[in-house]
């Protein structure tokens, strides 16, 4: 004989669990239906009547199958420095992301951003690393030999020094090399390519905003261990 299909509510067999999209109601001591995403429990089940579900009201949601008596409130509207990447619907919370030039300093459980901060800027001698800090902020790395950055920017990377046949001023981490004009009388001399070496540079990024976890890490060019620079108040 085929097994009987139990309709909710039903008492589970001893030691067994309720089926998918059901829950065990400890008061009724029955397996009862959950409500679908976008709904909540309006009336809990009894021993003889199943759960009654109702749609979430405006600005509230449930994302999962559930038996909550009230839907969750959607997060507040995105602030002026954010963009709404997911609207509040009956089945999902609003998600806010930071606009360009900012990173998320404080995330909610749902992945929305609660607080955006301006991206840190890397000063001369430092370029933006290809990877980001765990919090999404810019990582600055000292320009490696043969490269430089002469800007204060949250996007600029270290660029290679120009290659001179005759070097007038060597480049360093914060300035490009300056080439000497070629003399016609020296044009027969075999060319030597000069790649300048960087001079020691400070390792302090510029333009810090106070706030949570927003000090960028500085990656040295001497190894893989990052040096965490602490922001200090004052000059």
């Amino acid at each position: 004989l085929p097994a009987q299909v139990a309709f909710t509510p039903y008492a589970p067999e001893p030691g067994s669990t309720c089926r998918l999209r059901e829950y065990y109601d400890q008061t009724a001591q029955m397996c009862c239906s959950k409500c679908s995403p976008g709904q909540h429990a309006k009336v809990f089940c009894t021993k003889t009547s199943d759960t009654v579900c109702d749609s979430c009201e405006d600005s509230t949601y449930t994302q999962l199958w559930n038996w909550v008596p009230e839907c969750l409130s959607c997060g507040s509207r995105c602030s002026s420095d954010q963009v709404e990447t997911q609207a509040c619907t009956r089945e999902q919370n609003r998600i806010c992301a930071c606009e360009a030039g900012r990173y998320c300093a404080l995330k909610t459980h749902s992945g929305s951003c609660r607080q955006c901060m301006r991206l840190s800027k890397c000063g001369p001698g430092f370029g933006v690393a290809s990877s980001r800090a765990p919090n999404g902020n810019v990582l600055c790395k000292a320009c490696a030999p043969g490269t430089f950055s002469d800007t204060t920017s949250s996007t600029d990377v270290c660029r290679p020094h120009r290659i001179c046949s005759i070097l007038a001023i060597p480049g360093n981490a914060s300035t490009d090399a300056v080439c000497a004009p070629e003399s016609p009388t020296l044009s027969a001399i075999p060319r030597t390519l000069y790649v300048s070496q960087p001079e020691p540079t400070r390792s302090q990024p510029l333009d810090q905003e106070p706030g949570p976890s927003q000090t960028p890490s500085i990656l040295t060019s001497l190894g893989s261990t990052p040096i965490i620079e602490q922001s200090t108040k004052g000059g």
């Epitope: 309006k42 009336v43 009894t46 021993k47 003889t48 009547s49 009654v52 008596p69 009230e70």
Partner: antibody, heavy 119, light 106 residues
Framework: QVTLKESGPTLVKPTQTLTLTCTFS??????????VGWIRQPPGKALEWLAH???????YYNPALKSRLTITKDTSKNQVVLTMTNMDPVDTATYYC???????????WGQGTTVTVSS | DIQMTQSPSSLSASVGDRVTITCKAS??????IAWYQHKPGKVPKLLIH???TLQPGVPSRFSGSGSGSDYTLTISSLQPEDVATYYC????????FGGGTKVEIK
């Protein structure tokens, strides 16, 4: 407007059976999700839940008192009746009936009736 | 059965004080807790249900919080009319009231 009112004897003798009636208006026990429960409060003590009946006649009792309690409803009369057998002086209390919502909390209470158990 | 341990059993505070009452359940009650205000000679009045949902007409100085087995009722600024006994009710598994907290004005 939702109202509930308890009625019954004010004095019962030990070993007797207490019968209390809750008469309500402003809602119906034939409406999905509606329920009525009984709660008592002995003098100087905390509230204690006794029993509950739903619109679909499903009943729940306080496990400590289950053997002594019976709850019934008369939907047409808008009444719920609680009987409690083998009364004892420790059962002296104010007895309340209250409406219960579909999500199981009491939202509106009756004024209460005082029952004294004494010989 | 679920036991509800309510504390303190009584308290005395000044008008304007912040008052906190706690209820601890003997197991997880999934936020199914309500709070009632009971004044002498009056009917118990529902203040809050499902941990933090304020009943219509209840002053905003009353608030509820908690999860799992620990729950709190807070009166942010005690008023003379708040003198009463307050009870928690768990309704996660059957129904159990806490022992009550008598609130008085100093």
């Amino acid at each position: 407007q939702v109202t509930l009112k308890e009625s019954g004897p004010t004095l019962v003798k030990p070993t007797q059976t207490l019968t209390l009636t809750c008469t309500f208006s402003g809602f119906s026990l034939s409406t999905l999700g509606m329920g009525v429960g009984w709660i008592r409060q002995p003098p100087g003590k905390a509230l204690e839940w006794l029993a509950h009946i739903w619109w679909d006649a499903d009943k729940y009792y306080n496990p400590a008192l289950k053997s002594r309690l019976t709850i019934t409803k008369d939907t047409s009369k808008n009444q719920v009746v609680l009987t409690m057998t083998n009364m004892d002086p420790v059962d002296t209390a104010t007895y309340y009936c209250a409406r219960m919502t579909g999500t199981r909390y009491f939202d509106v209470w009756g004024q209460g009736t005082t029952v004294t158990v004494s010989s | 059965d679920i036991q509800m341990t309510q504390s303190p059993s009584s308290l005395s505070a000044s008008v304007g004080d912040r008052v906190t009452i706690t209820c601890k359940a003997s197991q997880n009650i999934n936020k199914f807790i309500a709070w009632y205000q009971h004044k002498p000679g009056k009917v118990p009045k529902l203040l809050i249900h499902y941990t933090s949902t304020l009943q219509p007409g209840v002053p905003s100085r009353f608030s509820g919080s908690g999860s799992g087995s620990d729950y709190t009722l807070t009166i942010s600024s005690l008023q003379p009319e708040d003198v009463a006994t307050y009870y928690c009710l768990q309704y996660g598994v059957l129904w159990t009231f806490g022992g009550g907290t008598k609130v008085e004005i100093k």
